[in-house]
């Protein structure tokens, strides 16, 4: 089953996906697609990396982290209701049928209030307010508001830098992470 992420219309959506390269600079191709992961590749590709760099990109879809260190999380800018749906993060590990596939469900909610026309730091709702985690027995729900007072843009960094913490494990379990090698 897909893990659910939420964002409001007009905000940025953040979909986490991680892997650990076997060696520095030893990257694995990754693709992001709209729709559940098919048997091969990604359907409706919105972004793709190869062994070195981003090699395909479409408007509003950006790599949000340091993808050369394995953070291939996706940011979708200025979302609309049409952006709702399943997204596939596919870690394309060499070999037959070795790929790791992660389906992430994005739910877009109508904006509660018409946002003021500020251009500054619209990341406040980039990470879902409510996230259902897995990997700790029964599904849990955590409200990010109960976390320490941190900038939500820091979440994926925390997941990288504080791997042993419960927050980091929850984030990685609720998104997608795989160790290569």
């Amino acid at each position: 089953s897909e893990v659910e992420y939420r964002a409001e219309v007009g905000q940025n959506a953040y979909l986490p996906c991680f892997y650990t390269p076997a060696a520095p600079g030893n990257l694995v191709p990754v693709c992001w697609g709209k729709g559940a992961c098919p048997v091969f590749e990604c359907g409706n590709v919105v972004l793709r990396t190869d062994e070195r760099d981003v090699n395909y990109w479409t408007s509003r879809y950006w790599l949000n982290g340091d993808f050369r260190k394995g953070d291939v999380s996706l940011t979708i800018e200025n979302v609309t209701l049409a952006d709702s749906g399943i997204y596939c993060c596919r870690i394309q590990i060499p070999g037959i049928m070795n790929d790791e596939k992660f389906n992430l469900k994005l739910v877009i909610k109508p904006a509660k209030v018409t946002p003021a026309p500020t251009r500054q730091r619209d990341f406040t709702a980039a990470f879902p307010r409510m996230l259902t985690t897995r990997g700790h027995g029964p599904a849990e729900t955590q409200t990010l508001g109960s976390l320490p007072d941190i900038n939500l843009t820091q979440i994926s960094t925390l997941a990288n830098e504080l791997r042993d913490s419960r927050l980091a494990n929850d984030l990685r379990d609720s998104g997608a992470t795989i160790r290569i090698g």
């Epitope: 940025n12 600079g25 408007s59």
Partner: antibody, heavy 122, light 108 residues
Framework: EVQLLESGGGLVQPGGSLRLSCAAS????????MSWVRQAPGKCLEWVSA????????YYADSVKGRFTISRDNSKNTLYLQMNSLRAEDTAVYYC???????????????WGQGTLVTVSS | SYVLTQPPSVSVAPGKTARITCGGD??????VHWYQQKPGQAPVLVIY???DRPSGIPERFSGSNSGNTATLTISRVEAGDEADYYC???????????FGCGTKLTVL
């Protein structure tokens, strides 16, 4: 060929304002995050501000937050830096720089303009 | 906040190997980028993502990054390599780009 051409620098009194422009050519402007980086005479490079490709998100160094505003006009392939409440310590060469492809923040600065000098003095 | 530490100066004889370091807490977990700046000129990217070289940059320039130190290595140094070299990272905790304060490479 990628080209970045800054303009708008000059001499301004403390407390004054200035607007820098950076005209970009040779690439799809809206596909790249852009930044302003400055360098005071004889000093280190200091990142000032960044803006995502669409202009939807902006980021500022603590030293300029609340005084400087970065913006972009993708239809004109131009990056701007509005500088208000200028101080003597803002005196520097200001460079515009292009980030890397497909990344929200830009990650690194692949191309740089030649810079424009801003002098804040009475 | 995150800090990058570079030695103020490095001296090397022509034809020898120069190593310029950039220190930071667990910097190996971040991608490091290096710039060369000659007097009166804009910086030029010489290494990105720890060890990648942009087109037009000689193979003599290489980079590595692990633990708490990133290193820019210039082999067979030439007089034209004399410049200031800056390391840079993106600090995702603050959403700030950070530069080291530069290392002046002097070719003896």
């Amino acid at each position: 060929e990628v080209q970045l051409l800054e303009s708008g620098g000059g001499l301004v009194q403390p407390g004054g304002s200035l607007r820098l422009s950076c005209a970009a050519s040779g690439f799809t402007f809206s596909s790249y995050a852009m930044s302003w980086v400055r360098q005071a005479p004889g000093k280190c490079l200091e990142w000032v501000s960044a803006i995502s490709g669409s202009g939807g998100s902006t980021y500022y160094a603590d030293s300029v937050k609340g005084r400087f505003t970065i913006s972009r006009d993708n239809s004109k392939n131009t990056l701007y830096l509005q500088m208000n409440s200028l101080r003597a310590e803002d005196t520097a060469v200001y460079y515009c720089a292009r980030g890397s492809y497909g990344t929200y923040y830009g990650n690194y600065f692949e191309y740089w303009g030649q810079g424009t000098l801003v002098t804040v003095s009475s | 906040s995150y800090v990058l530490t570079q030695p103020p100066s490095v001296s090397v004889a022509p034809g020898k190997t120069a190593r310029i370091t950039c220190g930071g807490d667990n910097i190996g977990g971040k991608s490091v980028h290096w710039y060369q700046q000659k007097p009166g000129q804009a910086p030029v990217l010489v290494i990105y993502y720890d060890s990648d070289r942009p087109s037009g940059i000689p193979e003599r320039f290489s980079g590595s990054n692990s633990g708490n130190t990133a290193t820019l290595t210039i082999s067979r140094v030439e007089a034209g390599d004399e410049a200031d070299y800056y390391c840079q990272v993106l600090d995702r905790r603050s959403d700030h780009f950070l530069f080291g304060c530069g290392t002046k490479l002097t070719v003896l």
